[in-house]
């Protein structure tokens, strides 16, 4: 299915416009901003979601900018260029003709340049480390229970296969979730770790992208797991190219 047929909505992306104008009167949904058709049986790509987010009228926006400490996009939100499959184009430019190269999750991986900047390929982010700090609880969570519940969450809510959740580390109050997915491992139909991480990030912030599903209610043996801060680190298959000036 591409969308819920009865009321023609997109369960996996509320930033869509849906109408029964698909083949045979089937419900078809298009992402805001880009107008691209989306498959509502799976997660929408981060690129299309960012584009939809930027297209939403500012006064009506229910979604907020990432917090300063999130390492996801420390350049802030931008209106990305997406390819016909909804992936980030390797080169992104703003309205003042400043350009930069991004990885598959849309994070800048080079210094900024001008229109002459070349980005030969979209470099894949193959390893994502999600670093969470949970609110104080009566005691520490059981590590194996926490591991099982987080893998179940990624499987059931984001449809990310457990094999892509490489590890769950826990040293109270810090939880680290490692997602790994090489190009060779990702089969057709597999959810991308970058998309799963973005949906998770938005869920943690109380900005769920799902339509009609409740917000994230994460519990370990009945005990609520409440996150008070999130940091996300991205590792690319090819190391980024920043000048020494930036590194100092």
């Amino acid at each position: 299915h591409t969308a819920a047929q009865d009321n023609c909505t997109c369960p996996t992306n509320k930033m869509t416009v849906c109408s029964p104008d698909g083949p045979g009167g089937r419900c078809q949904c298009r992402a805001l901003g880009s107008g691209m058709a989306v498959d509502c049986s799976t997660l929408t790509s981060k690129c299309l979601l960012l584009k939809a987010r930027m297209s939403a009228p500012k006064n009506a926006r229910t979604l907020v900018r990432p917090s300063e400490h999130a390492l996801v996009d420390n350049d802030g939100l931008y209106d990305p260029d997406c390819d016909p499959e909804g992936r980030f184009k390797a080169r992104q430019c703003n309205q003042t003709s400043v350009c930069w190269c991004v990885n598959s999750v849309g994070v800048r991986r080079t210094d900024k340049g001008d229109l002459s900047l070349r980005c030969d390929e979209l470099v894949r982010t193959h390893h994502i480390l999600i670093d969470l700090r949970h609110r104080p609880t009566a005691g520490a969570f059981n590590h194996s229970d926490l591991d099982a519940e987080l893998r179940r969450l990624f499987r059931e809510r984001y449809r990310l296969h457990p094999k892509f959740v490489a590890a769950v580390h826990y040293e109270q109050p810090t939880i680290q979730i490692e997602l790994r997915q090489n190009t060779s491992q990702k089969a057709a139909g597999d959810v991308d770790i970058g998309d799963a991480a973005y949906y998770f990030e938005r869920d943690i912030k109380g900005e769920s992208l799902f339509q009609g599903r409740g917000g994230l209610d994460l519990r370990v043996r009945g005990e609520p797991l409440q996150v008070e801060r999130t940091l996300i680190y991205y590792l690319d298959e090819i190391p980024p190219k920043f000048s020494m000036k930036r590194l100092t």
Epitope: H1, A4, P11, S41, S144, D147, A148, E149, R151, R152, R155, E156, R159, L160, H161, P162, K163, V165, V191, G212
Partner: antibody
Framework: QEQLKESGGGLVQPGGSLTLSCKAS????????VSWVRQAPGKGLEWIAY????????YYATWVNGRFTISSHNAQNTLYLQLNTLTAADTATYFC?????????????WGPGTLVTVSS | DVVMTQTPASVEAAVGGTVTINCQAS??????LAWYQQKPGQPPKLLIY???KLASGVSSRFSGGGYGTEFTLTISGVECADAATYYC????????????FGGGSEVVVK
């Protein structure tokens, strides 16, 4: 050929314990999740527990209440279900069932089952 | 806890006819529903997954439909070999679940 084969069933007294085994062959155990499902004589299917062997993640039906334990020996491609404090209500055929390898929980490979009879 | 309710518990079908079995989920499971066929003395066999997709080697006489909370299994051109008990199963979650299977529907072929 992909196969699952349960063993370890038999007659056990009320209050007793039993460990069931499920041997997998023809596929790599670590790429799938596996469940135990039981069926009392003339009744419907009842899910018991699920394990994702690679990470030893285990999940149980709410009614299990710690009486049963699912585990696996990955090198031997074998799944186990330990049954404790058995009562007559636990009399059933116990099946192991493998998921299809995706992210939903449909079971496309089943063993023939092993019968557990709890009686004095 | 998602509870699955199947109707009818038993249904008679004539050879060559059509039979429909219903399954209702207590809350939305989107399209995460599977159907199984079980014959006496045998383990269940997966027929349909994701509400409408035919499992490998299953006859196209079997079809599934529905979304959210209401689902159907339809057997068209019923054959004697279709006499069995059919079970639906929510395939969405194993968290806080009592039993993901419906109670079963027996199909008797006349």
């Amino acid at each position: 050929q992909e196969q699952l084969k349960e063993s370890g069933g038999g007659l056990v007294q009320p209050g007793g314990s039993l460990t069931l085994s499920c041997k997998a062959s023809g596929f790599d155990f670590n790429n799938y999740g596996v469940s135990w499902v039981r069926q009392a004589p003339g009744k419907g299917l009842e899910w018991i527990a699920y394990i994702y062997p690679t990470y030893h993640n285990t999940y149980y039906a709410t009614w299990v209440n710690g009486r049963f334990t699912i585990s696996s020996h990955n090198a031997q491609n074998t799944l186990y279900l330990q049954l404790n404090t058995l009562t007559a209500a636990d009399t059933a055929t116990y099946f192991c069932a493998r998921d299809a390898g995706g992210t939903d929980y449909n079971f496309n490979l089943w063993g023939p089952g092993t019968l557990v009879t709890v009686s004095s | 806890d998602v509870v699955m309710t199947q109707t009818p518990a038993s249904v008679e079908a004539a050879v060559g006819g059509t039979v429909t079995i219903n399954c209702q989920a207590s809350q939305s499971i989107e399209s995460y529903l599977a159907w199984y066929q079980q014959k006496p003395g045998q383990p269940p066999k997966l027929l349909i997954y994701e509400a409408s997709k035919l499992a490998s080697g299953v006859s196209s006489r079997f079809s599934g439909g529905g979304y959210g909370t209401e689902f159907t299994l339809t057997i068209s051109g019923v054959e004697c070999a279709d006499a069995a008990t059919y079970y639906c199963q929510q395939a969405l979650t194993i968290g806080n679940v009592d039993n993901p299977f419906g109670g079963g529907s027996e199909v008797v072929v006349k």
